[in-house]
Interface confidence: medium
């Protein structure tokens, strides 16, 4: 049962798993649910009721019931993770602490302007967790300013304690503000030889990079196949970093593999939804329950809702045994991972996926595309919106894309003469225009957010956010596409295609259906060469066959150029301007979706966050931000 | 074909910088991990550096650490080495060379550029 | 780091003979050994790979063996174009790559 509600003044009693330092009853959930085990914690507020030494622990806990005995504490605040639960998690926090240290080890101390700016910098450090910021009202006049960048084992605080005129954060790299790249290759017969912080099993290095990614101190990992030759390490999952945070050096071995954490781009991967079989092989660990199931399909379900199993193997029937169904051994661990491997016993394995909500809805895959043809069928690009005017009559105005549960990211000059929003609607899971009725359900629009540089198309800026007066719930149909990571802009994408009901000539009509051609991406030196009268940014990027005959055309704008990379579909583009439509050497410009990642999440966030008071939280104030783009869903 | 041309060579003093450029052709050089292999007069070969192919991982030899910089423009298809406090141990021919095929062996090379640290 | 060490330094040799180079490593590379050909005035040029596989355009009386910490390379009848100098290099643990000191093969 999923529980989001904290319980102030109250204790649960015994289950202690660890007991780590967090700055918020909040944060103490967010790290309670991204926990292997943990069920319920208990935070402990600031109080002058509470020994100082106790201030900010928060204990997680695990039960066998899922429920602990409750206990009157004043200034304790208790809750459930949200493992129970089935809306989307993340573990982004934006929030600022004034006048709390953060104990870590310092390893960086510069100056820094202003907190954001020491934000920032240990957003970009491939090593840094949180950090301290002493501000310029802080009483040693040698420590102003200072930003102090810090790590630990856990990724959480060693301690926290009070200190006036300095503030805390933690790192953004899950909210997806790094600038550091992603190293996505995982490189064969390779063997990356530097200290290992920890080691656990794994089916393939595909699972083994995604540990690593949200292990708190991995920045990069060796795996070891079912064929290397030392047995005792076979499957073996090492987590390792280095100092310069590269690995110093490359063993070439036969049968291993190594590759890196994308830590500063995990918003637009799978992280901890392990959702592949793995055949003839057992995963081993503490058994909590053996169920009788059909297929290995139902004994990943039977895992997945119940809360406590992280993993499972399904051994098949014999022929005429149980009426056809196998034995489903549903299994857990202290770290989530099995304890071992073996194959070659025909058991069937895989992992739990109630996990697949702590990663981006945008990363689920689609149905396979189908290739050739320029009409796209239903289900195809379920991200892609129609956007139409009911001014002075109803019409299709633009294309959009969904980023977020209540986020539409389009064009800034689709809303030319567009005096309010109240004469926008919003249609999803839309194939043909055809299908929009009087009666067919739609998504108002509660407000238009422009991008204040904007003036005209070509001169950039062409970017906006349409904020929805209800939220979409993802199905097949209407789901989110990824935005791309700051850290993937040197990603060279090779799978791109525009999509929308625009005309298919200059001088046509709006298409009925759902359009689609894949279109090469151009420099923009060579983009530059056949638009010598304007200037073309770093904040656009085009694409086009230097032949023409494919191209975005009016009625387009505002839609989506999405590029397949890695098995995820990334927004890389917003269809902006061009010169006529597919004329030989004349591109079509799009808005560079990346150049305004930090954008959408300023006005993403900004018009979610409240203060909440103190009564409201039991002796904490600061900022809560209640994200919903669709890497910082609503809890 | 295949074509590795280095340039920006010559004589320099002691304690002086050079910058030595490789123009690739006839490959996709952004697909691919580049080096810098140095060989004194009369010498043997000595690894300088290497960039990965994106550029996100580089490394020197012991003898060029913090004083040589590799680097790389991908949009150009072209390598750098940027030489900090030459000394005379450093006059060598520099090539610069790249690992194109699945193994970790050079298996494209360039002509050679002729560095000489003379005061 | 690892050392190579290429024995004879220099050898002597005429057209038609069966001339071998060995090359040995401070410690095991598995089989990740490269051999090159290098001549005066020019790069030089990848012959091995992988201690025994064979560049493509490379004439077949060249051949590599071994593994572990000791290689050869072997060229079966010696052509007037086959003087030069041999370089072999690991690429086990990168970085640093390192080569051997080289083998000058002259004519007798």
């Known amino acids: 049962e999923c529980v989001t509600q904290l319980l102030k003044d109250t204790c649960f009693e015994g289950g202690d798993i660890t007991t780590v330092f967090t700055p918020s009853a909040k944060y103490c959930q967010v790290v309670c649910t991204y926990h292997p085990r943990c069920l319920l914690f208990t935070f402990t507020a600031e109080s002058p009721s509470e020994d100082p030494t106790r201030w900010f622990t928060c204990v997680l806990k695990d039960s066998v019931t899922e429920t602990l005995p409750r206990v009157n504490r004043t200034a304790a605040i208790s809750g459930y993770s949200f493992k129970q639960c089935s809306h989307q998690i993340s573990a982004c926090n934006k929030d600022i602490y004034v006048d709390l240290d953060m104990k870590g080890i310092n390893y960086n101390s510069s100056v820094a302007k202003s907190a954001q700016e020491c934000q920032e910098r240990c957003t970009d450090d491939v090593h840094c967790h949180f950090f301290t910021y002493a501000t310029r009202q802080f009483p040693s006049l040698e420590h102003r300013n200072i930003c102090l960048l810090k790590h630990t084992q856990t990724g959480t605080p060693t301690r926290i304690t009070k200190l006036d005129k300095v503030v805390s954060g933690f790192s953004l790299k899950s909210c997806a503000l790094s600038n550091l790249a992603c190293i996505r290759d995982i490189f064969p017969n390779t063997v990356f030889a530097d200290s290992n912080i920890d080691s656990v099993m794994a089916p393939d290095a595909f699972v083994c990079g995604r540990i690593c990614t949200h292990h708190p101190g991995c920045l990069f990992f060796t795996f070891f196949s079912q064929e290397w030759p030392k047995e005792s390490q076979r499957n073996l999952c090492l987590l390792k970093t280095s100092e310069s945070g590269l690995p110093s050096t490359r063993i070439k071995k036969s049968k291993a593999l190594s590759g890196f954490s994308l830590q500063s781009c995990r918003h637009s991967i799978p992280v901890f939804c392990h959702s592949s079989f793995y055949h003839d092989t057992d995963f081993l660990g503490e058994e909590l329950d053996i169920v009788a199931a059909k297929s290995h399909e139902a004994c990943q379900k039977l895992c997945t809702n119940a809360v406590r199993c992280q993993f499972f193997t399904y051994t098949p029937a014999q022929a005429s045994c149980n009426e056809g169904k196998g034995k489903c051994y549903l299994k857990l661990s202290s770290n989530g991972s099995p304890t071992k491997i073996l194959h070659g016993r025909g058991g069937i394995s895989g992992y739990t996926l109630r996990l697949c909500k702590m990663d981006n809805e945008c990363t689920t895959k689609i149905k396979p595309r189908i290739v050739g043809g320029t009409a796209s069928v239903r289900g195809e690009w379920p991200w892609q919106v129609t956007l139409h005017t009911t001014s002075p009559t109803q019409r299709h105005l633009c294309g959009g894309s969904i980023i977020g549960n209540q986020w539409i990211l389009t064009a800034a000059h689709c809303f030319y003469g567009v005096e309010s929003p109240k004469i926008l609607r919003v249609y999803s899971g839309i194939l043909n225009q055809s299908e929009i009725k009087e009666d067919t359900s739609f998504f108002g629009v509660q407000e238009i957010i422009i991008h204040d540089q904007y003036k005209m198309a070509e001169s950039g800026y062409d970017i906006a956010l349409l904020k929805l007066e209800t939220t979409v719930n993802y199905t097949d149909s209407q789901r989110p596409i990824c935005l791309p990571s700051k850290g993937d802009r040197n990603v060279i994408y090779t799978d791109c295609w525009v999509t929308g009901w625009g005309y298919r000539k200059l001088r046509d009509k709006i298409q009925n259906t759902l359009q689609k051609a894949k279109i090469p991406l151009v420099t923009n030196e060579e983009c530059q060469k056949r638009y010598r009268g304007h200037k073309i940014t770093h904040k656009m990027i085009c694409a086009g066959y230097r032949e023409g005959g494919k191209d975005a055309c009016k009625g387009d704008s505002g839609g989506p150029l999405s590029c397949k990379h890695n098995e995820v579909w990334h927004l890389v583009g917003i269809t902006s301007w061009g010169e006529g439509c597919a004329q030989r050497e004349r591109p079509g410009v799009y808005t560079n979706v990346v150049e305004y990642v930090d954008w959408i999440l300023e006005k993403t966030q900004a018009v979610e966050q409240k203060l909440i008071s103190e009564e409201d939280l039991g002796g904490e104030q600061k900022l809560i931000s209640e994200e919903d783009l669709h890497h910082h869903h609503h809890h | 074909q295949v074509q590795l041309v280095e340039s920006g060579g010559g004589v320099v003093q002691p304690g002086r910088s050079l910058r030595l450029s490789c123009a690739a052709s006839?490959?996709?050089?952004?697909?691919?991990?580049m080096h810098w292999v140095r060989q004194t007069p009369g010498k043997g070969l000595e690894w300088v550096a290497l960039i990965w192919y994106d550029g996100s991982n580089k490394y020197s030899g012991d003898s060029v650490k913090g004083r040589f910089t590799i680097s790389r423009d991908n949009s150009k298809s072209t390598l750098y080495l940027q030489m900090n406090s030459l000394t005379a141990e450093d006059t060598a021919v520099y090539y610069c060379?790249?690992?194109?095929?699945?193994?970790?062996?050079?298996?494209?090379w360039g002509q050679g550029t002729m560095v000489t640290v003379s005061s | 780091d690892i050392q190579m060490t290429q024995s004879p330094s220099s050898l002597s040799a005429s057209v038609g003979d069966r001339v071998t180079i060995t090359c040995r490593a401070s410690q095991s590379i598995s089989s990740y050994l490269n051999w090159y050909q290098q001549k005066p005035g020019k790069a030089p040029k990848l012959l091995i790979y992988a201690a025994s596989s064979l560049q493509s355009g490379v004439p077949s009386r060249f051949s590599g063996s071994g593994s572990g910490t000791d290689f050869t390379l072997t060229i079966s009848s010696l052509q007037p174009e086959d003087f030069a100098t041999y370089y072999c290099q690991q690429s086990y643990s990168t970085p640093p790559i390192t080569f051997g000191q080289g083998t000058r093969l002259e004519i007798k």
């Open positions: 060379t790249g690992i194109t095929g699945t193994e970790d062996a050079f298996d494209v």
């Open positions: 006839g490959f996709t050089f952004s697909n691919y991990e």
